[in-house]
């Protein structure tokens, strides 16, 4: 670091004074130099380091009419916003000729009521549930002692008595407010006031109670609430990604969601307007007079199949001697699951109902006993699924085949024997 | 005799701009922080910012950040206030005004001792 | 920022009257506080620098004290020029701020 020579006298005729304040104080160091001749650039030094970005000024005033005559020169270095970094010891420099000279010092410090480095924030959290709080402060002067306060109450008997920079809550059962006074030989700084709203816990044990193709009846267990009674809960059911699923974790479904409410108690809902057999993700959240839990995972579950809801459409049946054709169209209506095939019964005049099941396919041909003398046979047709048959199609008669109306050649279905089983559609 | 005349004053639409002078004389720019204050009448006065003219530095208030900048020309011994993006708001007579520096090796804050005569600036459509 | 607030903001006196102003800061500012006195239509005079200096070639029968966060202007014995708005400012932090203004008008 440059240090002053003492060859010769010092030019140095105002030296910098002190300052001491608290952080955000404004301030300006000054020093007076004579010199003779061309008057020099002034420097500034904090503990002995040149600072190469100084706010300063610099002033000259000539004392007489010559170059050569004595200046005044004044320099001027600015404080804008005091910090702990800023203080230290200040001098002024100057080269003069081959000499270095430095003023006498002055001294920057930092005094003042104690400054938070960190204040409690304001947060939710669930009623009953444990959480920490965090309050740090600084001097000088230290040292500083922490004092917190739950709704304007102190928590110790006095600063420093306990705890310090974190606050360990166990749990609130209403919102409260938190703040931490800083105590030092100045004074007293008081923090910002944290509200901590409590909210419901999550609820917990979401499950299905019963199913149904287009409703699902679920349950859950409430959290507890603190002195807040629950005053709804919200379900969201939404239609799983094929093959993506929603993780467990996933804050938000893909698409937007089926949001229905329930009055507690009870803590049941019944959901409907679903699709049958269709795999759904549903969670519930629970909201109080101070705000709605956190959601519950996502519970993956699905509707069941149902029968469909219509019958097999546009039936046709012709007769040609002792054969039938009969074919049809899948039900327009909503099939409410998998479609595993058709059943169709005949049945004619004075004869038993036929019954078969046909499977996949959409037309039959349909071997029939004796000369084919029955008379007003008659055809009905259902489709099912895995929940069942739908419903049976209205019965259409038997048509006579005329030449030259088309004829599809159909594998042969002989008739069983016996019926597997009667239906009293007639 | 210490002396700091404003001038470059005058309506402007807002949105526009404005470049104000603060031309000083019997002392030099470069010993002293010039700041920039104006006044409204119902606003009382208001500081705008300030400059190092020797060193270039700048300070300001928030009101104006982005929108104003302080320059000084120490071989002209003026300092400029140019103002873009002016609103309604803005409307004021603007001062330039000299710190004191009188007051031993320290001193905590500052005062105005010089202030310019004022120049109005009116922002209106 | 620190808020300064000048009471009152206007007063009538007389010739002669003592006259007091008052301005509170909303955070301790030591002495960082200036006076100044502003006529219609001119700039703004300093009187007081530092809450108790009184700036060279302004007249005695101002005064200036207070420290912390109350400050008092005082005019011994109002004279005709001293009629205008006097305002109060800080300086310990930065942005400095302005008192609002006291209007002290001829009663």
């Known amino acids: 670091a440059p240090r002053g020579t003492q060859a010769e006298e010092s030019p140095f005729v105002g030296n910098p004074g002190n300052i001491t304040g608290a952080r955000g104080l404004t301030g300006t160091l000054r020093c007076q130099l004579q010199v003779q001749g061309e008057p020099p650039e002034v420097h500034w030094l904090r503990d002995g380091q040149i600072l190469e970005l100084a706010d300063s000024t610099q002033t000259q005033v000539p004392l007489g009419e010559d170059e050569q005559d004595d200046w005044i020169v004044v320099s001027q270095l600015r404080i804008t916003s005091l910090q702990l970094s800023d203080t230290g010891q200040y001098q002024c420099l100057v080269f003069l000729g081959h000499q270095t000279f430095v003023s006498q010092p002055g001294y920057v410090g930092l005094e003042g009521l104690p400054y938070f480095l960190e204040e409690p924030e304001d947060r939710t959290v669930a009623a009953n549930t444990p959480f920490n709080l965090s309050c740090q402060a600084q001097g000088p002067p230290e040292p500083v002692d922490l004092l917190w306060l739950q709704d304007a109450v102190p928590l110790a008997t006095a600063p420093g008595h306990g705890p310090q920079r974190s606050l360990h809550v166990p749990g609130l059962n209403k919102t409260s407010s938190f703040s931490c006074e800083a105590h030092n030989a100045k004074g007293v700084t008081t923090s910002r006031t944290a509200t901590i709203t409590v909210l419901p816990q999550q609820p917990r044990n979401l499950h299905l109670v019963s199913r149904q193709p287009t409703e699902l009846e679920v349950a859950w267990t409430p959290g507890l609430s603190g002195i807040y009674p629950l005053t709804h809960c919200t379900l969201q059911a939404v239609l799983s990604d094929d093959g993506m699923g929603i993780q467990a974790g996933e804050p938000d479904p893909p698409e937007e969601p089926l949001t229905s409410q329930a009055s507690v108690p009870p803590h049941q809902l019944r959901l409907g307007s679903l699709h049958p057999h269709t795999p759904y993700h549903i969670r519930v959240a629970c909201t109080s007079s101070q705000g709605p839990s956190s959601w519950t995972h996502w519970l993956p579950v699905e509707t069941p199949e149902g029968v469909p809801l219509g019958p097999p459409e546009n039936i046709s049946a012709t007769r040609n001697g002792s054969q039938a054709f009969v074919h049809w169209q899948e039900p327009r209506a909503p099939l409410q699951g998998t479609l595993l095939g058709y059943r169709l019964a005949y049945q004619g005049q004075d004869t038993p109902e036929v019954l078969m099941d046909i499977g996949l396919r959409q037309e039959v041909t349909l071997e029939l006993q004796g000369d084919g003398s029955v008379s007003n046979l008659t055809v009905c047709v259902a489709a099912y699924t895995a929940a069942g048959d739908g419903p049976w199609s209205l019965p259409v008669p038997l048509e006579a085949w005329r030449p030259g109306q088309a004829q599809p050649v159909h594998q042969l279905v002989k008739e069983p024997s016996t019926p597997a089983f009667s239906w009293p559609w007639w | 005799e210490v002396q700091l005349v404003e001038s470059g004053g005058g309506l402007v639409q807002p949105g526009g701009s404005l470049r104000l002078s603060c031309a000083a004389s019997g002392f030099s720019l470069s010993g002293s922080w010039i700041h920039w204050v104006r006044y409204a009448p119902g606003k009382g006065l208001e500081w705008v910012g300030w400059i190092n003219p020797y060193r270039g530095y700048a300070y300001y208030a928030d009101s104006v950040k982005g929108r104003f900048t302080i320059s000084a020309d120490t071989s002209k011994n003026t300092a400029y206030l140019q103002m873009n993006s002016l609103r309604a708001e803005d409307t004021a007579v603007y001062y330039c005004a000299r710190e004191y520096s009188g007051w031993g090796g320290s001193s905590v804050g500052y005062a105005m001792d010089y202030w310019g005569q004022g120049t109005l600036v009116t922002v209106s459509s | 920022d620190i808020q300064m607030t000048q009471s009152p903001s206007s007063l009538s006196a007389s010739v002669g009257d003592r006259v007091t102003i008052t301005c509170r800061a909303s955070q301790d500012v030591s002495t960082a506080v200036a006076w100044y006195q502003r006529k219609p239509g001119k700039a703004p005079k300093l009187l007081i620098y530092?809450?108790?200096f009184l700036y060279s070639g302004v007249p005695s029968r101002f005064s200036g004290s207070g420290s912390g966060t109350d400050f008092t202007l005082t005019i011994s014995s109002l004279q005709p020029e001293d009629f205008a708005t006097y305002y109060c400012q800080q300086s310990y932090t930065t942005p400095p701020t302005f008192g609002q203004g006291t209007k002290v008008e001829i009663k």
């Open positions: 530092s809450a108790s």
